[in-house]
């Protein structure tokens, strides 16, 4: 009996530009002889329904139809026909099919590959055109994919050390698509320093499918006319 097993759950998620290994394990009742078996990997795009051959392994020959695509002959010996794709790109997401032939038997499995890109986040202070005691803080998130993203603002005071979500005076702009297919977005928080306590910590909180934990960038209100420290102005909080 010949059986193929793909990633549990049927979906694999990988970061953009990563060297991804798309899993495909072979279960066969006898020891595998790689010189008398065949492996073919196919890819079907999310945008069009045509299946394309990515990689082929037959006996003493292998051929990559996508640059760098490889199945390890050394891993194949122990039943692992996983496909390595170096430098995975957003447009390579879709359905991958692993087809195994041990004549006269054939088995196959499919998996959905999702490619994600994590946002980089930074805080900026914009005082241009603002009234006295008023400041606008901008939280820029860039280079993320997919488009869905959640940006919130929180504050912590000495009186209330637990974060409180801010809903007023927050404007989040539209997402902008970059040339490489990733997205950018900016969220703005307007503050009136005369109404806020010095020592209050403000946080921009970014939640995205690519992140295990939210991305947090913060600044502290000082007694003097508040502004970001130099590091806060220039640092990338990724």
């Amino acid at each position: 009996d010949l059986k193929v097993e793909m990633m549990a759950g049927g979906t694999q998620i990988t970061p953009l530009n990563d060297n991804v290994t798309i899993f495909c394990n072979i279960f066969y009742s006898q020891p595998l002889n790689i010189t008398s078996m065949g492996i073919t990997w196919f890819w079907k795009s999310l945008t069009f329904d045509k299946e394309v051959k990515v990689f082929e392994f037959f006996g003493d020959h292998q051929e990559a139809f996508r640059p760098g695509a490889i199945v390890s002959p050394w891993r194949l010996k122990s039943g692992d026909a996983s496909l390595r794709l170096p430098g995975i790109q957003l447009e390579e997401a879709g359905e991958y099919r692993c087809e195994v032939v041990v004549t006269p038997l054939k088995a196959q499995g499919t998996v959905q590959l999702e490619v994600v890109a994590s946002p980089a986040s930074r805080l900026l202070l914009d005082q241009v055109g603002m009234k006295e005691n008023e400041d606008k803080y901008m939280c820029e998130s860039s280079g993320f994919y997919p488009e869905a993203i959640n940006i919130t603002w929180e504050k912590q005071t000495q009186k209330f050390p637990h974060p409180i979500e801010i809903s007023e005076d927050v404007i989040t702009g539209p997402t902008i698509k970059n040339m490489d297919g990733t997205f950018n977005v900016t969220s703005c928080l307007k503050l009136n320093s005369s109404q806020e306590d010095p020592g209050t910590v403000y946080q921009c909180v970014v939640r995205h499918a690519s992140l295990h934990t939210p991305l947090r960038s913060n600044f502290t209100l000082t007694a003097a006319r508040h502004s970001l420290s130099e590091t806060e102005k220039t640092d990338n909080f990724s």
Epitope: I70, W74, K77, S78, D80
Partner: antibody, heavy 120, light 111 residues
Amino acid sequence: EVQLVQSGAEVKKPGASVKVSCKASGYTFTDYNMDWVRQAPGKGLEWIGDINPNNGGTLYNQKFRGRVTLTVDKSISTAYMELSRLRSDDTAVYYCARSEVFYGNYADYWGQGTTVTVSS
Amino acid sequence: DIVLTQTPLSLSVTPGQPASISCKASQSVDYDGDSYMNWYLQKPGQPPQLLIYAASTLHSGVPDRFSGSGSGTDFTLKISRVEAEDVGVYYCQQSKEDPRTFGQGTKLEIK
């Protein structure tokens, strides 16, 4: 920085078993196989086998088949080599080595070695 | 099993002079256009370290005075100018077939 840290020296009696561990760090554990190689005192290198941490698949040198068991614990990025029914000629330094398997096959990083002495 | 025979088994070289080690395989170690021959150096009291893989590719961090060549059954490791730190035992290894096998080793000493 890639590191392979092996367990300490062992002294065993003939007929006993020994289990050597190899803790990996500094790379994605499942992206490389783990080779095991031994070296008897004053002798050359001898390949024992390898394990694929991705699926637990193993390849053994026929010479050791039935006596050696290679395993991994992915959760702690650790590989193990257990050798049973020990004989005096199993006295050697045992090495684990990270093995590239996609673009060629070679051991690019090695553990410091574990000395196993079999003596009655 | 593929048997690898190294020559010479030992050599003594003056610093700055070249050195060459041969490794002959009992059958071809080529597969699909590549040669699966690797070279390692084991310095005294240390584990082996990779020098060259796929017959001629220098491993990262290895000085370019080391070079490898050959295909099929005949392979050579060359050191263009031997340095004191090059002492140790050099092993060739084939990874085309299991069991992966090593040559018996060549001991390099400094004169």
